[in-house]
C-alpha cells in the first residue's frame, strides 16, 4: 500500500494522532497516540 503524509488541509483531521494518506485506497487514516481511539482519534480510553 502506497502511503504519504496528508495534505495540509487535513492538518486538524486527527485529534490525537498522525494523519496518513493511503494513496491506493484514496483515504486519510489516523494513527492514534496511545490511549486514543476512533476514526479521528477523538476518543480517550484508559
Amino acid at each position: 500500500v502506497s502511503i504519504t503524509k496528508c495534505n495540509s488541509d487535513m492538518n486538524g483531521y486527527c485529534l490525537h494522532g498522525q494523519c496518513i494518506y493511503l494513496v491506493d485506497m484514496s483515504q486519510n487514516y489516523c494513527r492514534c497516540e496511545v490511549g486514543y481511539t476512533g476514526v479521528r482519534c477523538e476518543h480517550f480510553y484508559l
Epitope: N7, S8, D9, M10, G12, N28
Partner: antibody, heavy 116, light 106 residues
Amino acid sequence: QDQLVQSGAEVKKPGASVKVSCKASGFNIKDTYIQWVRQAPGQGLEWMGRIDPLRRSTKYREKFEGRVTITADTSTNTAYMELSSLRSEDTAVYYCVRSGTSFDFWGQGTLVTVSS
Amino acid sequence: DIQMTQSPSSLSASVGDRVTITCKASQDIHKYIAWYQQKPGQAPRLLIQYTSTLQPGVPSRFSGSGSGTDYTFTISSLQPEDIATYYCLQYDNLRTFGGGTKVEIK
C-alpha cells in the same frame, strides 16, 4: 451503502436566502469533512467551502465569505449550506461532497434558481 | 487561495488520438491533484487522484503525471465515450478547480 441525499430544487427571488441540506447515511459525518461545490449552467465547478463537523470548524472561499454559512447537525447526520443575498448569478446546481475517509463522494446535487 | 490554470479550454481530436490537458498551480501542491470527467447533466466522475492514481473501473487509457506546480492529464487513445468536460482539482490547501477542458470529436 454510503449516501449523501440533498434537498430538492428551490426557486428564490433576488435578495432572499436559500438553505440546502445534505443528509448522510451509511457513515458518520463526524468522521469526514463536508465540502460544498456549485456549478452554474454551462459553467465550471466552483468550490465554496467546507465544514469539519467534529470540530465545528469551517473554511470558506474568499469570494463567498460573509454570504455563505455551512453548518452541521451531528445528531441528524446532516450538513447545511446557506447562501444569502441571492442574485441571478447564484443560479446553479449545488453539491455536497464528502472527503476525509474517502476521496470525494458526491451528493446528487440541488438546483437553486434565482429569478424575479 | 491557490489558483489553477487549466489549458486548453477546449480541443477537438479524432478517435484514437492522444489528448493532453495541463494544469498549472500558483504554488506547489505536492501532487495533491485530482482529475474529473463530467458529461452533460451528470455529476462529475473522479478518474484520478494524487496525480496518477487511477480509480477502480477507470480505463487505463487515462493517466496523470506531474509534480510541484505543473500537472498533465492524458488520454492515450481517444474514444467516442470520452467526449466530456475534464476538470483538475487541487486539494492540498483547501480546494480549487481548474476552468475545465471541453473535449470534442473531430
